[in-house]
């Protein structure tokens, strides 16, 4: 039995930051779980891990240098990413593993979310106005 995951097909990070919500067909309340976010078609880069184990507080970390935070809903984990770079535009996949109570459960691979990181563009300065006519 696999958990189903729903994600937005695409998100745009305008200010180098984005919130990605992973919605599960499973209630995480009072469960020990490991939710993670992976980058790339092959999910090769583990961007962020959110670990929950009954306590009210989530443990959040990244082994790959991403600035992330997480928020837990009954059937969702929202990943907050900051300081993203344009070259980190990619497809991102949510993953969930429930360790306790048995049985161990994980998810069917989702369709993923394309995160498009927009560079910061400076507004062009207005042209210097010429001398006013008398």
């Amino acid at each position: 039995n696999k958990i189903l995951v729903k994600q937005s097909p695409m998100l745009v990070a305008y200010d180098n930051a984005v919130n990605l919500s992973c919605k599960y067909s499973y209630n995480l309340f009072s469960r020990e779980f490991r939710a993670s976010l992976h980058k790339g078609l092959d999910s090769a880069v583990e961007v962020c891990v959110v670990y929950g184990n009954y306590s009210q507080q989530l443990q959040v970390y990244s082994k790959t240098g991403f600035n992330c935070d997480g928020k837990l809903g009954n059937e969702s984990v929202t990943f907050y990413l900051q300081n993203l770079y344009v070259n980190q535009t990619d497809i991102y996949f949510c993953k969930i593993e429930v360790m306790y109570p048995p049985p161990y459960l994980d998810n069917e691979k989702s369709n993923g979310t394309i995160i498009h990181v927009k560079g910061k563009h400076l507004c062009p300065s207005p042209l210097f106005p010429g001398p006013s006519k008398p």
Partner: antibody, heavy 120, light 107 residues
Framework: EVQLVESGGGLVQPGGSLRLSCAAS????????MHWVRQAPGKGLVWVSR????????SFADSVRGRFTISRDNAKNTLSLQMNSLRAEDTAVYYC?????????????WGQGTLVTVSS | EIVLTQSPATLSLSPGERATLSCRAS??????LAWYQQKPGQAPRLLIF???NRATGIPARFSGSGSGTDFTLTISSLEPEDFAVYYC?????????FGQGTKVEIK
């Protein structure tokens, strides 16, 4: 005026436990992420842990993960660091610092620090 | 994690002189770099954030510049109270990391 005042430091044996506290005043405590940063005698600054503004998530440096826990009481404007299984290398001055919730690791105010000495 | 290397380790100068401190990152941190001042027995104090923005109450003689991997803190004319240790810190990548410090001492 923003004030952060740490307490709870002292001498503890290896393997022992200690709980540090940080009392905050002069700002809306619940709007800020809070951090612990330490400094071993004569050494540089090392980030230890953080907690988000509502206390629902936390992160730890690899060197302390599994041994330290962080918590906050927004009603009492206090931050705590529970340190277990202490080692000699945990000897340091521990500072609490605040960071705006929009720029999580930008430490704009620091406390004066509390010294933790782990020795037998 | 990102390693920040500060140079020189010690800078010996006289009051009124210009101080130039360097911080180099092992990979790009964009402009997510801060500078702190620490005096003996005191807590660090934020001087500059996001590479070039002065923190509240910091005198104009302190300025920061740079982006990517190379950053500079400049003190245009040293005052007696500026002799201290200066640390850079990045918040681009997790975990946040600090440089090892540059001590500015009286010549």
């Amino acid at each position: 005026e923003v004030q952060l005042v740490e307490s709870g430091g002292g001498l503890v044996q290896p393997g022992g436990s200690l709980r540090l506290s940080c009392a905050a005043s002069g700002f809306t405590f619940s709007s800020y992420w809070m951090h612990w940063v330490r400094q071993a005698p004569g050494k540089g600054l090392v980030w230890v842990s953080r907690i988000n503004n509502d206390g629902s998530s936390a992160s730890f440096a690899d060197s302390v993960r599994g041994r330290f826990t962080i918590s906050r009481d927004n009603a009492k404007n206090t931050l705590s660091l529970q340190m277990n299984s202490l080692r000699a290398e945990d000897t340091a001055v521990y500072y609490c610092a605040r960071a705006d919730s929009s720029s999580w690791y930008h430490f704009d105010y620091w406390g004066q620090g509390t010294l933790v000495t782990v020795s037998s | 994690e990102i390693v920040l290397t500060q140079s020189p380790a010690t800078l010996s100068l006289s009051p009124g002189e210009r101080a130039t401190l360097s911080c180099r990152a092992s990979q790009s941190v964009s402009s997510y770099l801060a500078w702190y001042q620490q005096k003996p027995g005191q807590a660090p104090r934020l001087l500059i954030f996001d590479a070039s923005n002065r923190a509240t109450g910091i005198p104009a003689r302190f300025s920061g510049s740079g982006s990517g991997t190379d950053f500079t803190l400049t003190i245009s004319s040293l005052e007696p109270e500026d002799f201290a240790v200066y640390y850079c810190q990045q918040r681009s990548n997790w975990p946040p990391t600090f440089g090892q410090g540059t001590k500015v001492e009286i010549k």
